[in-house]
């Protein structure tokens, strides 16, 4: 079967501030099995967005079903954005390991940029 | 706390319909997948049926086009329509959440169906 | 489908080390988890994702995976860790939920 690939079609998308971000990411399998993560940045500082398996993300929300047991898509929706959130953000597709899970394929990322509210 | 309370198991002929229903209480219901499991009597586990948060099904192939599993998000409660109901579908019917990979976190105490002519 | 095999029976003396194997299934498609269910009541998971213990499980529960073998190992087997212990798994292939037969533990 095709390896897995992790798709970000957008590679850049413009959102005025106070409004919601849309950004679209699919995989094109669901094997390996494991989480799905969203970061922004890339490299050991990266900073944690979303994580499919567990925590509290407030401002997040999930644009598809992710409970459906064949789903593919991962897109995440952003509130209320501020110029502090730009940058570019990776979705990241994991599989399963022990003690940990193991970063398996990234998308090549959305660079969000954050138009300033008319005055 | 996370409670899960089955209802609607009794004695019924072969043929005849149950619907079964699941109480839960102490976790957003809508954010949870759920699923179904049985257990006839001395035997051991098998998954029945699941259902994503949105309403999409699962089902084992055996009770395939004789089960219905659904939600009622707003009343908080999980159901299992059973219909042309066999001997084989004797057992305590568990419904269970799901964790986030479709694995099974919390159980409820079961809800015992016994088909018998 | 797959099915998933594990040992209908282990008996351990108290303070051992009881180690419970579970076979089948394919490691990049699978994740796996262990119930245990007591006489009479309803089953509780001790093990979930193949290693990962709920907060209110004891930790001389744990799990670990190898291939296409899983192992749910109890440290220091008490009395009351007397049970039927059952490996479940998901797979990604097939959306459906699997169990092993089950495994009686006996404590001596």
């Known amino acids: 079967e095709e390896e897995l690939q992790v798709i970000q079609p957008d590679k850049s998308v413009l959102v005025a501030a106070g409004e919601t971000a849309t950004l679209r990411c699919t995989a094109t399998s669901l094997i390996p099995v494991g989480p799905i993560q969203w970061f922004r940045g890339a490299g050991p500082g990266r900073e944690l967005i979303y994580n499919q398996k567990e925590g509290h993300f407030p401002r997040v929300t999930t644009v598809s079903d992710l409970t459906k047991r064949n789903n593919m898509d991962f897109s995440i929706r952003i509130g209320n954005i501020t110029p502090a959130d730009a940058g570019t953000y990776y979705c990241v597709k994991f599989r399963k390991g022990s003690p940990d899970d193991v970063e398996f394929k990234s998308g090549a990322g959305t660079e969000l940029s954050v138009r300033a509210k008319p005055s | 706390d996370v409670q899960l309370v089955e209802s609607g198991g009794g004695v019924v002929r072969p043929g005849e319909s149950l619907r079964l229903s699941c109480a839960v209480s102490g976790f957003r219901f809508s954010s949870y997948a759920m699923s179904w499991v049985r257990q006839a009597p001395g035997k051991g586990l098998e998954w029945v049926s699941g259902i994503s948060s949105g309403g999409d099904t699962y089902y084992v192939d055996s009770v395939k086009g004789r089960f219905t599993i659904s939600r009622d998000n707003s009343k908080n409660t999980l159901y299992l329509q059973v219909n042309s109901l066999t001997a084989e579908d004797t057992a305590i019917y568990y419904c269970?959440?799901?964790?986030?990979?479709?694995?099974?976190?919390?159980w409820g105490l079961g809800t015992l169906v016994t088909v018998s002519s | 489908s797959y099915e998933l095999t594990q040992p209908p029976s282990v008996s351990v003396s108290p303070g051992q080390t009881a180690r419970i194997t579970c076979s089948g299934g394919d490691y990049y498609s699978t994740y796996y988890a262990w119930y245990q269910q007591k006489p009479g009541q309803a089953p509780v998971t001790v093990i979930h994702?193949?290693?990962k213990r709920p907060s209110d499980i004891p930790e001389r529960f744990s799990g670990s995976s190898s291939g296409t073998t899983v192992t749910l190992t109890i440290s220091g087997v008490q009395a009351e860790d007397e049970a039927d212990y059952y490996c479940?798994?998901?797979?990604?292939?097939?959306?459906?939920?699997?169990f092993g037969g089950g495994t009686k533990l006996t404590v001596l």
């Open positions: 479940g798994g998901y797979d990604g292939r097939t959306y459906i939920n699997t």
């Open positions: 994702s193949d290693d």
């Open positions: 269970a959440r799901e964790t986030w990979n479709h694995l099974f976190d919390y």
